[in-house]
Amino acid sequence: RGVFRRDAHKSEVAHRFKDLGEENFKALVLIAFAQYLQQCPFEDHVKLVNEVTEFAKTCVADESAENCDKSLHTLFGDKLCTVATLRETYGEMADCCAKQEPERNECFLQHKDDNPNLPRLVRPEVDVMCTAFHDNEETFLKKYLYEIARRHPYFYAPELLFFAKRYKAAFTECCQAADKAACLLPKLDELRDEGKASSAKQRLKCASLQKFGERAFKAWAVARLSQRFPKAEFAEVSKLVTDLTKVHTECCHGDLLECADDRADLAKYICENQDSISSKLKECCEKPLLEKSHCIAEVENDEMPADLPSLAADFVESKDVCKNYAEAKDVFLGMFLYEYARRHPDYSVVLLLRLAKTYETTLEKCCAAADPHECYAKVFDEFKPLVEEPQNLIKQNCELFEQLGEYKFQNALLVRYTKKVPQVSTPTLVEVSRNLGKVGSKCCKHPEAKRMPCAEDYLSVVLNQLCVLHEKTPVSDRVTKCCTESLVNRRPCFSALEVDETYVPKEFNAETFTFHADICTLSEKERQIKKQTALVELVKHKPKATKEQLKAVMDDFAAFVEKCCKADDKETCFAEEGKKLVAASQAALGL
């Protein structure tokens, strides 16, 4: 059976149940429902999932049974629309239920909320978690899927199954350990951090597909897979790109059963043909399915083939460039991107896509000119500034990071981005700038050849977080412009923004800068966030404040918190010293 070329099935739900098995089927349906109805209680979702599963089993027994021929969207949509409190809980999303498929599913997709109003997940005591795990392992793991899926409505579903498997393994091992906390907490921290990163990466893939179309996603995939599999033929890369695009289109479209099934098929195909794809796949291909798919997705770049010919000969010097381009534009551009990317694992994917776009624009112009060859002869010279811009930016920022350390580097970015786009909400500016700042510890440790792909492609993921959060409640034309004009130029667009001179400073509000003794019991991370929130508010009040002024105020603030947290009567200290600090800060900033 060719990958994705399936026989027609009388019952799609039976087909997927059989392919995936009951456990994965139930988990994926739960994820799908939680990603659509993000506010519904856990118990309601479990009930819906059980009903769908029982129905699927009747279809497995008899594919001709009533309703078994219905599409998955119809079955799942009908089930979601039975929720009694739909109108009260979700407001206008309830209107989706008046629509027919496929419009109904599109409507549900449009109502996915990247920043749902849900309480922060608080981690219970280790003993409490271990008891819950032992009492009802199945419910405990379902709850994990539910809580992650509803907070991350675009989380890559088959990958969430992999996270859940690791979550289960952590509890299985650590709840028997002598020091449960020492065993479990680092594992949970790692899963949390990896999960957030995975969610953000997938969110960019979905944004790419949904906002910029399949061609944009395919171009990204050609570049990335060509870097990763430089020994593979162009046709092999093209086939993988086509299949990968189908998988991500399905997952981003809420077709999670099809997505998981097709991802498994793709992993199988890659492993069966690894000799033609990459020498680095051997270990991945020996693992069980979920680990295998994850491992393939993260596999290191294969070595570049020796003696690759110069690109200039066929893409610039040849007199046949326009003829070859005209024959099949996207294939020719795809080959250019493939050939360039496999030679440049040291470039970010977004840089490679900028180069390909420049090449395409040049051919469009030159192939209509009187002397095409003369016109496009210098096209590679146009690449130089495009390559140097991210190189210089990364060099400067890594130097700054090494000089300041992560926290102060984040603060520098907080100030920089608040001045660029002060209309953006303070929590979003704090979250995004903190994540932008993490590029330092993540990428600056790498040698030159790995810095750019690490840094710029990571920044694309973080800036997409800003774009999706801003899209929900747009407040800045500059953010909208950078987010919507070009996917690959988002980072250069934001980098190029200067201080927003049109911004009217925020009114001073002493309450914003009033702190209480509860800050003393916060974790170091939470305390940093409090201070960074104050810093953003300070810049919003005084956008023209100098670095020196802001540093002085922040240093005073840190000293104030440290002093009051050591005081016997903390609350009184915060009240009295806080007033003095606010007055001194106002004076220092001329507020």
């Epitope: 033929e233 046709a235 070859n324 099949a328 294939v331």
Partner: nanobody
């Protein structure tokens, strides 16, 4: 439509060399991925080497790496296969094939659209 015509086959002693040629005519875009395949008696047709006429990238099956070299002359629309250190197991009919670069995969002959008649290479003492 595309026509492919191989030449250069023959009898050679083990350790010897041969150079195969393949002249292509017709729509050259349809031949922008070209390859050499071989079929020994009683065996399936297998990919030997392929080249993109745009970009110039080359690919070889493991058993011929370091011994065979594929090349092309775009101005003459001709594909070559330089075969050195020939062994008796290299004996086969060698076919020239062509197709679209977005489809052609060396391990899968069905992804090539156009084929020559073949030229016999015999390695024997």
């Amino acid at each position: 439509e595309v026509q492919l015509l191989e030449s250069g086959g023959g009898l050679v002693q083990p350790g010897g060399s041969l150079r195969l040629s393949c002249a292509a005519s017709g729509n050259t875009y349809l031949t922008s991925c070209m390859g050499w395949f071989r079929q020994a008696p009683g065996k399936e047709r297998e990919g030997v080497s392929s080249i993109y006429t745009v970009g110039g990238s080359t690919f070889y099956t493991n058993s011929v790496k370091g011994r065979f070299t594929i090349s092309r002359d775009n101005s003459k629309n001709t594909l070559y296969l330089q075969m050195n250190s020939l062994q008796p197991e290299d004996t086969a009919v060698y076919y020239c094939a062509a197709g679209s670069p977005a489809r052609c995969r060396l391990r899968d002959p069905t992804t090539f659209d156009y084929w020559g008649q073949g030229t016999l290479v015999t390695v024997s003492s």
